[in-house]
């Protein structure tokens, strides 16, 4: 089944602002889960990033990363996520379906969830941003 | 054992600004929760009045009323929150306490602490 | 953003099953924490998280809910529950804020 455009695409100066502002967000994210002592990355999750089979800007996986950051808000109620999830919003360009992800049970193994999703999140912003900017370069060449 | 010691309370006259202090103690301060301001007029309910996080991000929550009047600040170094409250008036008489809040699943109920509260009387 | 608690007050005997309830304005996502107080004394956390045993509470205090409603149930009222309960909801998330539940005394029927 096709999905319908809910949005007009972003000119791409207007996503790289959005995304540079998510590499922001998602490196103070990072900071602060990184503050809880103990806890390890686990191999169990993966957040999707980008696309191969896609041009930027249109290769950010958002509706799915938007999934898993959501995930992450049932856990925790730090503001940065609130404003993280926002910012993601103005990158889904058309209706996706609902990315289900299951929430670990295990207090300790949410820890793990929150941390692993938070620095494969500011990675992926990392790349996004170079997949951007490399973008921008092979047009203007 | 980690404690939140308020002080700065007394009386002040209608009009007067007065800065409540929270120090916390046996623990610092940390990304993973809230410490907020919650105060009780004598034989009345809870309520609440500003929360600033502990984190990269100081975000501050206020209670509609508290906007304007009431300022809520931090200092790590001294591990203590503010409350700064002007234009006092006979219906901010209360106990203030100083309340520590989980920001999610981190360390589960031991995120909840309250202090003993300090008494705020306006009156002329 | 509005926290409903009801009722304002019951009375009750020992040994009776209490259910107070708290009605939130909007979905707060189980960010829902209920608390004894007694005169004199700050708020003591009895339910976080909706329905999590808080540490050293007895285990006839318990919470369920989700969404915007939440209830709190004391299975068999001892003579130490004699107090004010409160539910709270401590979400830092910029749509919803924080509150308190307007109190449900709970005192000795007769």
């Known amino acids: 089944s096709h999905t319908l455009p809910v949005r007009l695409l972003r000119p791409s100066d207007d996503v790289q602002k959005i995304v540079e502002e998510l590499q922001s967000l998602s490196k103070m994210l990072l900071k602060d889960v990184e503050e809880e002592k103990g806890v390890l990355v686990s191999q169990n999750y993966t957040l999707p990033c980008l696309s191969p089979d896609a041009q930027p800007p249109n290769n950010i996986h958002s509706p799915a990363i938007r999934a898993y950051l959501k995930t992450i808000r049932q856990l925790d109620n730090k503001s940065v996520i609130d404003e993280i999830i926002e910012h993601l919003d103005k990158l889904i360009f058309q209706d996706a379906p609902e990315t289900n992800i299951s929430v670990p049970t295990d207090t300790h193994e949410c820890k793990r969830f929150i941390l692993t999703i938070s620095q494969q999140f500011s990675e992926c912003m990392d790349l996004a941003l170079k997949s951007l900017t490399s973008g921008a370069q092979q047009a203007t060449t | 054992q980690s404690q939140l010691v308020e002080s700065g309370g007394g009386l002040v006259q209608p009009g007067g600004s007065l800065r409540l202090s929270c120090a916390a103690s046996?623990?610092?301060?940390?990304?993973?929760?809230?410490i907020c301001w919650v105060r009780q007029a004598p034989g009345k309910g809870l309520e609440w009045i500003v929360c600033i996080s502990i984190g990269s991000r100081a975000d501050t929550y206020y209670a509609p009323w508290a906007k304007g009047r009431f300022t809520i600040s931090k200092d790590n170094s001294k591990n203590t929150v503010y409350l700064q409250m002007n234009s006092l008036r006979a219906e901010d008489t209360a106990v203030y306490f100083c309340?520590?809040?989980?920001?999610?699943?981190?360390?589960?109920?031991?995120?909840?602490?309250w202090g003993q509260g300090t008494l705020v009387t306006v009156s002329s | 953003f509005q926290l409903t608690q009801s009722p304002s007050s019951l009375s009750a005997s020992v040994g009776d099953r209490v259910t107070i309830t708290c009605q939130a304005s909007?979905?707060?996502?189980?960010?829902l924490a209920w608390y004894q107080q007694k005169p004199g004394k700050p708020p003591k956390l009895l339910i976080y998280?909706?329905?999590k045993l808080a540490s050293g509470v007895p285990s006839r205090f318990s919470g369920s809910g989700s969404g915007t409603d939440y209830t709190l149930t004391i299975s068999s009222l001892q003579p130490e529950d004699f107090a004010t309960y409160y539910c709270?909801?401590?979400?830092?998330?910029?749509?919803?804020?924080w509150g308190f539940g307007t109190g449900t005394k709970v005192t000795v029927l007769g």
């Open positions: 046996g623990f610092s301060f940390s990304a993973n929760y809230w």
């Open positions: 309340a520590r809040f989980s920001s999610g699943i981190y360390d589960l109920d031991r995120f909840f602490l």
């Open positions: 909007q979905s707060i996502d189980s960010w």
């Open positions: 998280q909706a329905s």
């Open positions: 709270q909801t401590y979400y830092g998330g910029g749509h919803i804020g």
